[in-house]
């Protein structure tokens, strides 16, 4: 995505108050937590905690909150310029190729195999062979040993699937 | 990922009225904003009127401003379009489309999902 000017980068006089609920239009653009009246002569705040926009836009609504699923822990609200950060629950992940849901992560190895990676809110334990190190991945045949997984701190954001 | 279907196209006289739906399949239809646009023969697309996720904001084209009515339910997960005072140029392929929010010139923003359009032909 290409560098947005952010609403610091404006002169002071540009600049929409906080409690501002219409603004007009820089350049034919609002700014972040804003959106663009239907005649394009208004910027319109955000509802917070209902909806947000992030950058400098000519959209005519704010996109909706994500709501945390349930298995879903939330890490921050949404503001009129973020959305909300949801992060898989301890104990569960989320792939890369089916970020909708969380996935309960393994809790141990299987036969031959031994534990390299804890279970982290984005990915799975991680197994490599006993003697050759090479990973392990997809489901448990059997479990060797149960592994108490521990959850990552960092946070990911949600997808605006919710 | 969503799935959407038109249906209320027709053949109506001028002056008459019709209503279009739209329904959606998949459970996130209250995320996304949703759009009619419109297609007259050998015409380009044209952006008719757009409504928000909670459906208390809209946008209508001039062209279709005080004529058109569009409103959805998001318990029946179906978007509308109330056409009234219709006229030989409103004839076209109407297409409801989903996205998460909407340009004033028509663009989508963000992931969005296409119907396959129905008729509306207006004439004596």
């Known amino acids: 995505e290409s560098a947005l000017i952010t609403q610091q980068d404006l002169a002071p006089q540009q600049r929409a108050a906080p409690q501002q609920k219409r603004s007009s239009p820089s350049e034919g653009l609002c700014p972040p937590g804003h959106h663009i009246s239907e005649d394009g002569r208004d910027c319109i705040s955000c509802k917070y905690g209902q909806d947000y926009s992030t950058h400098w836009n000519d959209l005519l609504f704010c996109l909706r909150c994500t709501r945390c699923d349930s298995g879903e822990v939330e890490l921050s609200p949404c503001t009129t310029t973020r959305n909300t950060v949801c992060q898989c629950e301890e104990g569960t992940f989320r792939e890369e190729d089916s970020p909708e849901m969380c996935r309960k992560c393994r809790t141990g190895c299987p036969r031959g195999m031994v534990k390299v990676g804890d279970c982290t809110p984005w990915s799975d334990i991680e197994c490599v062979h006993k003697e050759s190190g090479t990973k392990h991945s997809g489901e448990v045949p059997a479990v060797e040993e149960t592994v108490t997984s521990s959850p990552g701190t960092p946070a990911s954001p949600c997808s605006l699937s919710g | 990922e969503v799935q959407l279907l038109e249906s209320g196209g027709g053949e109506v006289q001028p002056g008459g009225s019709l209503r279009l739906s739209c329904a959606a399949s998949g459970r996130t239809f209250t995320n996304y904003a949703m759009s009619w646009f419109r297609q007259a023969p050998g015409k380009g697309l044209e952006f008719v009127s757009a409504i928000n996720w909670s459906g208390d904001s809209t946008y209508y084209a001039e062209s279709v401003k005080g004529r058109f009515t569009i409103s959805r339910d998001n318990a029946k997960n179906t978007l509308y379009l109330q056409m009234s005072s219709l006229r030989a140029e409103d004839t076209a392929v109407y297409y409801c489309?989903?996205?998460?929010?909407?340009?004033?010139?028509?663009?989508?923003?963000?992931?969005?999902?296409w119907g396959q359009g129905t008729l509306v032909t207006v004439k004596p």
């Open positions: 489309a989903s996205a998460e929010s909407f340009s004033r010139g028509g663009l989508p923003y963000g992931m969005n999902y």
